[in-house]
Protein backbone atom coordinates (compact mmCIF):
# COMPACT_ATOMS: atom_id res chain seq x y z
CA UNK A 1 0.00 0.00 0.00
CA UNK A 2 1.82 3.38 -0.91
CA UNK A 3 2.27 5.85 1.70
CA UNK A 4 0.11 8.60 0.59
CA UNK A 5 2.15 11.19 2.71
CA UNK A 6 5.59 12.24 3.21
CA UNK A 7 8.24 11.70 6.06
CA UNK A 8 8.06 14.03 8.40
CA UNK A 9 10.54 16.97 7.80
CA UNK A 10 13.74 17.40 10.16
CA UNK A 11 15.73 21.14 10.34
CA UNK A 12 18.93 20.85 9.17
CA UNK A 13 18.62 17.15 8.36
CA UNK A 14 18.45 14.81 5.64
CA UNK A 15 17.22 11.20 4.83
CA UNK A 16 17.51 7.76 2.91
CA UNK A 17 16.19 4.55 2.77
CA UNK A 18 18.86 1.72 3.26
CA UNK A 19 16.80 -0.39 0.98
CA UNK A 20 13.50 -0.39 -0.43
CA UNK A 21 10.26 -2.16 0.78
CA UNK A 22 8.60 -4.58 -2.23
CA UNK A 23 6.13 -2.31 -3.74
CA UNK A 24 8.69 0.97 -3.74
CA UNK A 25 8.20 2.74 -7.03
CA UNK A 26 10.60 4.78 -8.75
CA UNK A 27 9.71 7.30 -11.63
CA UNK A 28 11.91 6.66 -15.06
CA UNK A 29 12.80 10.52 -15.24
CA UNK A 30 15.13 12.01 -17.92
CA UNK A 31 17.52 14.84 -17.74
CA UNK A 32 17.09 17.93 -19.46
CA UNK A 33 16.77 17.17 -23.58
CA UNK A 34 16.04 13.73 -23.20
CA UNK A 35 11.82 11.62 -22.31
CA UNK A 36 11.19 8.21 -21.54
CA UNK A 37 10.77 5.99 -24.74
CA UNK A 38 7.49 6.25 -25.34
CA UNK A 39 6.94 2.23 -25.03
CA UNK A 40 9.00 2.29 -21.67
CA UNK A 41 7.23 2.76 -18.02
CA UNK A 42 6.79 5.46 -16.35
CA UNK A 43 8.14 3.73 -12.82
CA UNK A 44 10.19 1.02 -12.27
CA UNK A 45 8.80 -1.24 -9.36
CA UNK A 46 10.17 -3.20 -6.35
CA UNK A 47 9.07 -7.05 -7.09
CA UNK A 48 10.09 -10.00 -5.65
CA UNK A 49 9.32 -13.74 -4.03
CA UNK A 50 10.46 -15.20 -1.03
CA UNK A 51 13.82 -15.18 -2.12
CA UNK A 52 14.55 -12.26 -4.45
CA UNK A 53 13.50 -8.90 -4.66
CA UNK A 54 14.22 -6.77 -7.92
CA UNK A 55 13.11 -3.52 -9.73
CA UNK A 56 11.08 -4.44 -12.22
CA UNK A 57 10.92 -2.62 -16.03
CA UNK A 58 13.84 -0.29 -16.84
CA UNK A 59 13.73 3.17 -17.07
CA UNK A 60 15.56 4.53 -20.83
CA UNK A 61 15.76 7.79 -22.21
CA UNK A 62 15.73 8.80 -25.38
CA UNK A 63 16.82 12.46 -26.87
CA UNK A 64 13.30 14.91 -27.07
CA UNK A 65 15.01 15.87 -30.50
CA UNK A 66 14.58 12.20 -31.95
CA UNK A 67 11.74 10.75 -33.65
CA UNK A 68 10.26 7.78 -33.58
CA UNK A 69 13.69 6.29 -32.52
CA UNK A 70 14.45 4.69 -29.30
CA UNK A 71 17.95 4.86 -29.90
CA UNK A 72 20.82 6.16 -26.82
CA UNK A 73 22.06 9.29 -27.56
CA UNK A 74 26.44 9.40 -26.40
CA UNK A 75 26.58 11.51 -24.05
CA UNK A 76 29.07 15.03 -24.08
CA UNK A 77 32.34 14.36 -22.50
CA UNK A 78 30.64 17.12 -20.07
CA UNK A 79 27.84 14.14 -19.69
CA UNK A 80 29.98 11.61 -19.49
CA UNK A 81 31.54 12.99 -16.44
CA UNK A 82 28.61 13.78 -14.79
CA UNK A 83 27.08 9.65 -14.62
CA UNK A 84 30.51 8.73 -14.36
CA UNK A 85 30.19 10.21 -10.48
CA UNK A 86 26.28 8.75 -10.57
CA UNK A 87 27.49 5.61 -11.45
CA UNK A 88 30.47 5.69 -8.66
CA UNK A 89 28.04 6.99 -6.03
CA UNK A 90 25.47 4.04 -6.88
CA UNK A 91 27.92 1.58 -6.35
CA UNK A 92 29.36 3.39 -3.10
CA UNK A 93 25.88 2.97 -1.69
CA UNK A 94 25.00 -0.49 -2.74
CA UNK A 95 28.23 -1.62 -1.13
CA UNK A 96 26.78 0.15 1.82
CA UNK A 97 23.10 -1.73 1.52
CA UNK A 98 22.48 -4.88 3.70
CA UNK A 99 20.67 -7.46 1.81
CA UNK A 100 16.94 -7.57 3.55
CA UNK A 101 14.49 -10.08 2.70
CA UNK A 102 11.66 -8.43 0.75
CA UNK A 103 13.74 -5.24 -0.28
CA UNK A 104 15.16 -3.98 -3.48
CA UNK A 105 18.98 -2.24 -3.24
CA UNK A 106 18.83 1.28 -4.96
CA UNK A 107 18.75 0.67 -8.50
CA UNK A 108 21.82 1.58 -10.95
CA UNK A 109 21.38 5.18 -12.48
CA UNK A 110 19.96 4.46 -16.35
CA UNK A 111 21.69 6.50 -19.72
CA UNK A 112 20.35 10.45 -19.34
CA UNK A 113 18.59 9.97 -16.22
CA UNK A 114 17.35 12.91 -14.39
CA UNK A 115 19.60 14.43 -11.35
CA UNK A 116 16.98 13.71 -9.11
CA UNK A 117 14.87 10.43 -8.06
CA UNK A 118 11.45 10.82 -6.97
CA UNK A 119 10.56 7.51 -5.05
CA UNK A 120 7.18 6.73 -3.58
CA UNK A 121 7.11 4.66 -0.46
CA UNK A 122 4.96 1.96 1.19
CA UNK A 123 3.51 1.14 4.10
CA UNK A 124 6.47 -0.33 6.05
CA UNK A 125 8.80 1.61 4.51
CA UNK A 126 11.76 2.67 7.33
CA UNK A 127 13.81 6.06 6.58
CA UNK A 128 16.84 6.88 8.34
CA UNK A 129 17.89 10.39 8.97
CA UNK A 130 21.17 12.23 9.57
CA UNK A 131 22.14 15.91 10.72
CA UNK A 132 23.40 17.76 7.66
CA UNK A 133 27.24 18.66 7.68
CA UNK A 134 28.02 21.79 10.34
CA UNK A 135 25.11 20.05 12.44
CA UNK A 136 25.16 17.24 15.13
CA UNK A 137 22.69 15.16 16.82
CA UNK A 138 21.57 17.05 20.07
CA UNK A 139 19.20 14.69 21.12
CA UNK A 140 19.30 10.90 20.11
CA UNK A 141 16.26 8.44 20.18
CA UNK A 142 15.83 5.97 16.82
CA UNK A 143 16.70 8.75 14.32
CA UNK A 144 14.14 7.19 12.21
CA UNK A 145 10.82 6.99 10.51
CA UNK A 146 8.24 4.22 9.52
CA UNK A 147 5.31 4.94 6.96
CA UNK A 148 2.34 3.07 8.97
CA UNK A 149 -1.09 2.69 8.15
CA UNK A 150 -3.94 3.47 10.87
CA UNK A 151 -7.46 3.56 9.89
CA UNK A 152 -6.79 3.45 6.01
CA UNK A 153 -4.65 6.42 6.35
CA UNK A 154 -0.76 6.15 6.16
CA UNK A 155 1.36 8.26 8.42
CA UNK A 156 5.35 8.46 9.12
CA UNK A 157 6.27 8.30 12.78
CA UNK A 158 8.24 11.15 14.21
CA UNK A 159 12.28 10.56 14.38
CA UNK A 160 13.62 11.74 17.60
CA UNK A 161 16.24 14.05 16.50
CA UNK A 162 17.50 17.36 16.70
CA UNK A 163 20.25 18.77 14.60
CA UNK A 164 21.94 21.72 16.13
CA UNK A 165 25.55 23.31 16.98
CA UNK A 166 28.75 22.72 14.52
CA UNK A 167 30.48 19.34 14.54
CA UNK A 168 30.37 16.22 12.39
CA UNK A 169 27.54 14.66 11.14
CA UNK A 170 26.37 12.05 12.82
CA UNK A 171 25.96 8.88 10.75
CA UNK A 172 23.30 6.58 9.44
CA UNK A 173 23.01 3.07 10.43
CA UNK A 174 26.21 0.65 9.38
CA UNK A 175 28.28 3.81 7.86
CA UNK A 176 32.05 3.95 9.62
CA UNK A 177 33.21 7.50 11.16
CA UNK A 178 34.89 8.88 8.62
CA UNK A 179 38.91 9.04 9.39
CA UNK A 180 38.74 12.87 9.62
CA UNK A 181 36.23 15.60 9.75
CA UNK A 182 34.08 16.93 7.00
CA UNK A 183 34.74 19.89 8.37
CA UNK A 184 38.33 19.92 7.63
CA UNK A 185 37.54 20.04 3.59
CA UNK A 186 37.14 22.54 1.68
CA UNK A 187 33.15 22.93 0.54
CA UNK A 188 34.29 22.28 -3.27
CA UNK A 189 35.59 18.78 -2.18
CA UNK A 190 32.43 17.78 -0.33
CA UNK A 191 28.63 17.08 -1.53
CA UNK A 192 25.72 19.52 -1.34
CA UNK A 193 22.75 18.21 -0.11
CA UNK A 194 19.80 20.53 -2.04
CA UNK A 195 16.39 20.45 -0.53
CA UNK A 196 14.16 18.44 -2.64
CA UNK A 197 10.27 17.09 -2.26
CA UNK A 198 8.13 14.45 -2.57
CA UNK A 199 10.90 11.34 -1.82
CA UNK A 200 13.53 13.05 -4.43
CA UNK A 201 17.04 11.92 -4.23
CA UNK A 202 19.50 14.56 -5.22
CA UNK A 203 22.35 12.98 -7.13
CA UNK A 204 26.05 15.27 -6.75
CA UNK A 205 28.93 14.97 -7.54
CA UNK A 206 31.09 13.03 -4.58
CA UNK A 207 34.65 13.82 -4.07
CA UNK A 208 35.46 11.46 -1.01
CA UNK A 209 34.67 8.10 -0.39
CA UNK A 210 32.42 8.79 2.90
CA UNK A 211 29.69 11.33 0.92
CA UNK A 212 26.77 8.81 -0.49
CA UNK A 213 23.64 9.74 -1.52
CA UNK A 214 20.80 10.90 0.72
CA UNK A 215 17.28 11.28 0.26
CA UNK A 216 16.72 14.79 1.23
CA UNK A 217 14.37 17.11 3.25
CA UNK A 218 11.16 18.88 2.21
CA UNK A 219 10.91 22.16 1.33
CA UNK B 1 -15.65 19.64 10.08
CA UNK B 2 -13.59 18.35 6.89
CA UNK B 3 -15.16 19.62 3.58
CA UNK B 4 -14.16 20.07 -0.03
CA UNK B 5 -16.69 22.84 -2.04
CA UNK B 6 -15.97 22.58 -5.81
CA UNK B 7 -16.72 25.14 -8.03
CA UNK B 8 -19.83 25.17 -10.35
CA UNK B 9 -20.37 23.32 -13.45
CA UNK B 10 -19.00 24.54 -16.78
CA UNK B 11 -20.08 24.62 -20.44
CA UNK B 12 -17.11 24.76 -22.28
CA UNK B 13 -16.14 24.80 -26.87
CA UNK B 14 -13.96 22.47 -27.71
CA UNK B 15 -10.33 23.47 -28.07
CA UNK B 16 -10.56 25.38 -25.03
CA UNK B 17 -9.98 25.68 -21.18
CA UNK B 18 -11.20 24.85 -17.75
CA UNK B 19 -9.62 25.64 -14.18
CA UNK B 20 -12.28 23.34 -11.63
CA UNK B 21 -11.53 24.75 -7.95
CA UNK B 22 -11.63 22.71 -4.54
CA UNK B 23 -11.60 24.61 -1.22
CA UNK B 24 -11.06 23.24 1.83
CA UNK B 25 -11.88 23.71 5.37
CA UNK B 26 -11.32 21.95 8.43
CA UNK B 27 -7.96 20.56 8.79
CA UNK B 28 -5.06 21.82 7.90
CA UNK B 29 -4.50 22.00 4.08
CA UNK B 30 -0.86 21.06 3.66
CA UNK B 31 -1.36 18.17 5.85
CA UNK B 32 -2.82 16.09 2.92
CA UNK B 33 -1.91 15.13 -0.19
CA UNK B 34 -5.36 16.37 -2.84
CA UNK B 35 -6.47 14.07 -5.38
CA UNK B 36 -8.90 13.97 -8.21
CA UNK B 37 -11.14 11.80 -9.83
CA UNK B 38 -12.96 12.04 -13.12
CA UNK B 39 -16.32 10.70 -14.21
CA UNK B 40 -17.59 10.61 -17.37
CA UNK B 41 -21.41 10.16 -18.07
CA UNK B 42 -22.45 6.65 -17.17
CA UNK B 43 -18.96 5.08 -16.70
CA UNK B 44 -16.34 4.34 -13.27
CA UNK B 45 -14.01 6.62 -11.62
CA UNK B 46 -10.71 7.68 -12.74
CA UNK B 47 -7.79 8.42 -11.01
CA UNK B 48 -6.38 11.49 -12.40
CA UNK B 49 -3.54 12.97 -9.89
CA UNK B 50 -2.44 14.27 -6.81
CA UNK B 51 -0.89 17.67 -5.50
CA UNK B 52 1.48 17.90 -2.43
CA UNK B 53 0.09 21.48 -1.12
CA UNK B 54 2.86 21.46 1.21
CA UNK B 55 5.31 21.12 -2.09
CA UNK B 56 3.50 21.50 -4.88
CA UNK B 57 4.61 18.08 -6.22
CA UNK B 58 2.14 16.49 -8.44
CA UNK B 59 1.70 12.65 -9.81
CA UNK B 60 -0.48 12.29 -12.71
CA UNK B 61 -2.14 9.35 -14.41
CA UNK B 62 -0.17 8.82 -17.59
CA UNK B 63 -3.35 9.20 -19.07
CA UNK B 64 -4.14 12.77 -18.18
CA UNK B 65 -0.46 14.07 -18.51
CA UNK B 66 -0.90 16.15 -21.58
CA UNK B 67 -4.68 16.96 -20.15
CA UNK B 68 -4.68 18.32 -16.54
CA UNK B 69 -2.47 20.52 -14.71
CA UNK B 70 -2.72 20.27 -11.32
CA UNK B 71 -1.84 23.26 -8.79
CA UNK B 72 -2.67 24.43 -5.04
CA UNK B 73 -2.82 28.14 -3.07
CA UNK B 74 -2.08 27.69 0.79
CA UNK B 75 -3.16 31.17 1.25
CA UNK B 76 -6.64 30.21 0.25
CA UNK B 77 -6.35 26.58 1.18
CA UNK B 78 -7.96 25.71 -2.74
CA UNK B 79 -6.73 23.60 -5.12
CA UNK B 80 -7.06 23.53 -8.52
CA UNK B 81 -7.14 21.45 -11.68
CA UNK B 82 -6.98 22.89 -14.97
CA UNK B 83 -8.23 20.79 -18.24
CA UNK B 84 -6.53 21.95 -21.72
CA UNK B 85 -7.28 21.34 -25.34
CA UNK B 86 -11.42 20.48 -24.20
CA UNK B 87 -13.28 17.46 -26.64
CA UNK B 88 -16.43 16.20 -26.25
CA UNK B 89 -14.79 13.18 -24.37
CA UNK B 90 -13.51 15.02 -21.17
CA UNK B 91 -17.14 15.73 -20.68
CA UNK B 92 -17.22 14.73 -17.11
CA UNK B 93 -17.94 15.11 -13.19
CA UNK B 94 -14.75 15.85 -11.64
CA UNK B 95 -13.86 15.16 -7.94
CA UNK B 96 -11.39 16.46 -5.70
CA UNK B 97 -10.57 14.24 -2.78
CA UNK B 98 -8.74 14.07 0.63
CA UNK B 99 -5.61 11.89 0.30
CA UNK B 100 -3.54 10.64 3.18
CA UNK B 101 -4.54 7.28 2.53
CA UNK B 102 -7.87 6.65 1.33
CA UNK B 103 -10.44 8.80 -0.14
CA UNK B 104 -12.52 9.75 3.14
CA UNK B 105 -13.47 13.39 2.11
CA UNK B 106 -14.78 14.06 -1.87
CA UNK B 107 -15.90 17.13 -3.03
CA UNK B 108 -19.81 17.28 -3.99
CA UNK B 109 -18.10 17.35 -8.11
CA UNK B 110 -17.99 19.63 -10.62
CA UNK B 111 -19.76 18.64 -14.01
CA UNK B 112 -17.64 20.01 -17.33
CA UNK B 113 -19.41 19.69 -19.97
CA UNK B 114 -17.65 20.67 -23.44
CA UNK B 115 -19.84 20.74 -26.68
CA UNK B 116 -19.85 23.06 -29.48
CA UNK C 1 -1.46 -0.66 -15.08
CA UNK C 2 -3.17 -2.84 -11.93
CA UNK C 3 -6.95 -3.57 -13.71
CA UNK C 4 -9.62 -4.13 -11.84
CA UNK C 5 -12.37 -6.31 -12.78
CA UNK C 6 -16.02 -6.50 -10.75
CA UNK C 7 -18.68 -8.81 -11.30
CA UNK C 8 -21.24 -9.12 -11.57
CA UNK C 9 -21.88 -5.47 -13.78
CA UNK C 10 -25.42 -4.84 -12.37
CA UNK C 11 -27.22 -7.23 -9.65
CA UNK C 12 -30.86 -7.16 -8.99
CA UNK C 13 -31.96 -8.28 -5.62
CA UNK C 14 -34.76 -7.15 -2.97
CA UNK C 15 -34.72 -6.40 0.24
CA UNK C 16 -33.40 -8.46 3.10
CA UNK C 17 -31.36 -10.46 -0.02
CA UNK C 18 -27.54 -11.66 0.62
CA UNK C 19 -25.92 -10.06 -2.21
CA UNK C 20 -22.28 -10.33 -2.68
CA UNK C 21 -19.69 -8.54 -5.50
CA UNK C 22 -16.53 -9.87 -6.06
CA UNK C 23 -13.27 -7.32 -7.39
CA UNK C 24 -10.39 -8.83 -8.94
CA UNK C 25 -7.60 -7.45 -9.54
CA UNK C 26 -5.06 -8.47 -12.12
CA UNK C 27 -2.09 -8.55 -10.20
CA UNK C 28 -1.41 -9.09 -6.37
CA UNK C 29 -2.34 -5.77 -4.27
CA UNK C 30 -1.91 -5.48 -0.60
CA UNK C 31 -5.38 -4.31 0.61
CA UNK C 32 -8.84 -3.57 -1.53
CA UNK C 33 -11.38 -0.75 -0.79
CA UNK C 34 -14.63 -0.14 -1.55
CA UNK C 35 -16.67 2.95 -2.25
CA UNK C 36 -20.70 3.25 -2.50
CA UNK C 37 -21.97 5.76 -4.90
CA UNK C 38 -25.69 7.10 -5.20
CA UNK C 39 -27.16 9.23 -8.67
CA UNK C 40 -25.94 12.50 -8.59
CA UNK C 41 -23.86 12.52 -5.23
CA UNK C 42 -19.76 11.97 -4.77
CA UNK C 43 -18.43 8.56 -3.43
CA UNK C 44 -18.78 7.71 0.06
CA UNK C 45 -16.00 5.45 1.46
CA UNK C 46 -17.45 1.78 2.67
CA UNK C 47 -14.67 -0.22 3.79
CA UNK C 48 -11.08 0.54 3.52
CA UNK C 49 -7.70 -2.02 4.25
CA UNK C 50 -10.15 -4.72 3.00
CA UNK C 51 -12.34 -5.47 6.04
CA UNK C 52 -12.44 -2.70 7.93
CA UNK C 53 -15.32 -0.44 8.17
CA UNK C 54 -15.93 3.16 7.40
CA UNK C 55 -17.08 5.41 10.46
CA UNK C 56 -21.05 5.23 10.24
CA UNK C 57 -20.74 2.12 7.88
CA UNK C 58 -23.48 -0.42 9.27
CA UNK C 59 -22.84 -3.45 10.38
CA UNK C 60 -24.11 -5.72 7.50
CA UNK C 61 -22.00 -4.46 4.99
CA UNK C 62 -18.15 -6.93 5.25
CA UNK C 63 -15.05 -7.07 3.11
CA UNK C 64 -12.71 -10.26 2.72
CA UNK C 65 -10.12 -11.44 0.32
CA UNK C 66 -6.41 -11.10 -0.18
CA UNK C 67 -4.07 -11.22 -3.47
CA UNK C 68 -5.72 -10.99 -6.39
CA UNK C 69 -9.88 -11.83 -5.39
CA UNK C 70 -11.74 -9.66 -2.92
CA UNK C 71 -15.21 -9.73 -2.14
CA UNK C 72 -17.78 -6.84 -0.97
CA UNK C 73 -21.24 -8.36 1.13
CA UNK C 74 -24.19 -7.27 2.26
CA UNK C 75 -25.71 -9.58 5.03
CA UNK C 76 -29.27 -8.47 4.57
CA UNK C 77 -29.77 -5.77 1.94
CA UNK C 78 -31.99 -2.83 3.19
CA UNK C 79 -33.44 0.21 0.55
CA UNK C 80 -30.77 2.36 1.28
CA UNK C 81 -28.17 -0.17 -0.39
CA UNK C 82 -29.08 0.34 -3.66
CA UNK C 83 -26.44 2.00 -5.34
CA UNK C 84 -23.16 1.54 -6.99
CA UNK C 85 -20.16 0.01 -5.41
CA UNK C 86 -16.82 0.54 -6.63
CA UNK C 87 -13.27 -1.63 -5.63
CA UNK C 88 -10.52 0.17 -5.62
CA UNK C 89 -6.42 -0.33 -5.42
CA UNK C 90 -3.90 1.92 -3.69
CA UNK C 91 -0.65 -0.46 -3.91
CA UNK C 92 0.37 0.72 -6.86
CA UNK C 93 0.29 4.15 -9.22
CA UNK C 94 -1.88 4.72 -11.33
CA UNK C 95 -4.80 4.04 -8.96
CA UNK C 96 -7.42 2.52 -10.44
CA UNK C 97 -10.83 1.68 -9.43
CA UNK C 98 -13.44 -1.43 -10.47
CA UNK C 99 -16.22 -0.24 -13.26
CA UNK C 100 -18.48 -0.65 -10.95
CA UNK C 101 -21.35 -2.61 -9.48
CA UNK C 102 -24.87 -1.31 -9.55
CA UNK C 103 -27.38 -2.61 -7.38
CA UNK C 104 -30.84 -2.17 -8.06
CA UNK C 105 -34.47 -3.20 -7.38
CA UNK C 106 -35.35 -6.35 -8.37
Known amino acids: ELCDDDPPKITHATFKAVAYKEGTMLNCECKRGFRRIKSGSPYMLCTGNSSHSSWDNQCQCTSSAARNTTKQVTPQPEEQKERKTTEMQSQMQLADQVSLPGHCREPPPWENEATERIYHFVVGQTVYYQCVQGYRALHRGPAESVCKMTHGKTRWTQPQLICTGETEPSQFPGEEEPQASPDGLPESETSRLVTTTDFRIQTEVAATMETFIFTTEYQ | QVQLVQSGAEVKKPGSSVKVSCKAS????????MHWVRQAPGQGLEWMGYINPSSGYTEYNQKFKDKATITADESTNTAYMELSSLRSEDTAVYYC?????????WGQGTLVTVSS | DIQMTQSPSTLSASVGDRVTITCSAS?????MHWYQQKPGKAPKLLIY???NLASGVPARFSGSGSGTEFTLTISSLQPDDFATYYC?????????FGQGTKVEVK
Open chain 3, 49 to 51: TTS
Open chain 3, 27 to 31: SSISY
Open chain 2, 26 to 33: GYTFTSYR
Open chain 3, 88 to 96: HQRSTYPLT
Open chain 2, 97 to 105: ARGGGVFDY
